[in-house]
């Protein structure tokens, strides 16, 4: 429970204005009415409140809106957004992209990745799906924010908006997110020619299955090592030396540089040494010639 103090008559607040910057914390607590603050939120960001004063204003809004702020207040939070926790934001219902833009601008230059991720999640929930307008807003105001969405939220992305996604927007996407986005990208780009298709699908390949990688290896795509290193380990392991050679083309030499890193290291361990030797790269760690490979995982699965 908060310590209650009475507001001195001369400090009574009838308007949210600049005079409040001279109020001490206790005076703000006693004199600023939360309902008045909410009604005049559009004035708050123009007033140079200290962080301590912003804390009081946040607590006032929490008092008024225990179930989460309404969008009419959220859109005018301004720098007060910097005081919000992911738990606060999780209570919100946001549908307006103007609200999203305003808060993304405020968050720039501040360590607020968790808050921004939660905000974007609330927008997607509020709008029913990650539509083209939302995706455009994210790419314009928060490159990389797409990857802050959970795989569950990304599953609502219609394939039609995949074309608007830029490679840099996917830089921070994890495997589970790419697992969701890749099939959508494959669908979105299915009518493109070979080389054009590869350019478009490349940023999404971290979600590609083995069969699709095998198919790509037949198309002279010359995959760069950076893309190869982002492929799913499970998708790379079944590829033969010949398939990897075809997939990488002239970039195959890069395997030597990456031989100690996954997925290259794990893939090497699965290949016959004599097959690896055909690459002429001096890759070591393959299965010695004459050894029989027993896949015990299959037997375990059956028993």
């Amino acid at each position: 429970d908060v310590e209650r103090t009475t507001c001195p008559p001369e400090k009574e607040v009838h308007e949210i204005d600049e005079s409040l910057i001279f109020y001490k914390k206790r005076e703000l607590e006693a004199c600023v009415d939360a309902a008045l603050l909410a009604a005049q939120m559009d004035r708050v960001d123009a007033i140079p409140f200290t962080y301590e004063q912003l804390d009081v204003l946040k607590h006032k809004l929490d008092e008024l809106y225990p179930q989460g702020y309404p969008e009419s207040v959220i859109r005018h939070l301004g720098h007060l957004f910097l005081k919000m926790s992911p738990e606060d934001i999780r209570k919100w219902n946001v549908t307006s992209l103007e609200t999203l833009k305003a808060l993304l601008k405020v968050s720039k230059g501040h360590e607020m990745s968790a808050q921004v991720a939660t905000l974007i999640d609330r927008v997607v929930v509020g709008r029913g799906q990650l539509d083209k307008d939302t995706a455009d807003t994210l790419t314009a105001f928060c490159p990389g924010c797409l990857c802050s969405l959970s795989p569950e939220r990304l599953s609502s992305v219609p394939p039609s908006i995949i074309g608007a996604v830029r490679p840099q927007d996917l830089d921070t996407c994890g495997p589970r997110q790419l697992d969701v986005l890749y099939p959508k990208a494959r669908l979105a780009f299915q009518n493109m020619s070979g080389s054009e298709y590869f350019v478009k699908i490349r940023p999404f390949l971290g979600g590609a299955p083995t069969e699709d990688l095998k198919a790509l290896s037949q198309q002279n795509v010359s995959m760069d090592l950076a893309t190869f290193m982002k492929l799913r380990r499970e998708a790379v392991l079944p590829l033969s030396v010949a398939e990897v050679q075809k997939l990488l083309g002239p970039h195959v030499e890069g395997l030597k540089v990456e031989e100690q890193h996954s997925p290259v290291r794990d893939w090497i361990l699965k290949q016959r040494q004599d097959d690896l030797d055909t690459l002429g790269l001096g890759l070591q760690g393959g299965i010695p010639n004459g050894y029989l490979i027993l896949d015990l995982s299959v037997r375990e699965a059956l028993s």
Epitope: D1, V2, R4, C7, H14, E15, E29, A30, C31, V32, D33, A34, A35, L36, A38, A39, Q40, H59, K60, E63, L64, Y65, P66, Q67, P70, S72
Partner: antibody, heavy 119, light 108 residues
Amino acid sequence: EVQLLESGGGLVQPGGSLRLSCAASGFTFTHTYMSWVRQAPGKGLEWVSNISPTYSTTNYADSVKGRFTISRDNNKNTLYLQMNSLRAEDTAVYYCARYNAYHAALDYWGQGTLVTVSS
Amino acid sequence: EIVLTQSPGTLSLSPGERATLSCRASQSVSSSYLAWYQQKPGQAPRLLIYGASSRATGIPDRFSGSGSGTDFTLTISRLEPEDFAVYYCQQALGYPHTFGQGTKVEIK
């Protein structure tokens, strides 16, 4: 079910005092702004006062400022209106009402208690 | 203080007719902070419309609200016998949270 039950009204002489109570139930009182609204006989509604849930910040109509005091006891789920220096023009039915911050409106009202100031 | 002026003072209509009530504010009021109430004789007021146009729980759809800035309207599309009452608008933008003086809708 939300219920607001006012009590404490009655006949009082000019200059006298009276304390109104409003017992609340059916909602989280500790999270809710509460208000008093009055209605003089045959007249319209007049907003009197309100109080915030946590900080107990108060606001008053100019006509009652300095004479009336709104307060609450969150442990008892009860709202109060202490009325001092009563005047004939304070004669009215006093309603306790819940302010819904999400609607910015008074969404539940009590049935009212009559205060008569007369000599 | 924000003054709300309602018009007309009294509206004489027959059941089935359309009622249009006006509420004018002395200064601009955000629509989020404008509400309408109905009061019948001997009863407490009842919230009808909040946020200028959203119907409160249990309010029939013949009641609708509109407007922004300084001009707001409550419309009853087809008057039912139980709709004859006094209607008040209220603003909660600034203190005091003033009411209009009311419009009485009576049977012609």
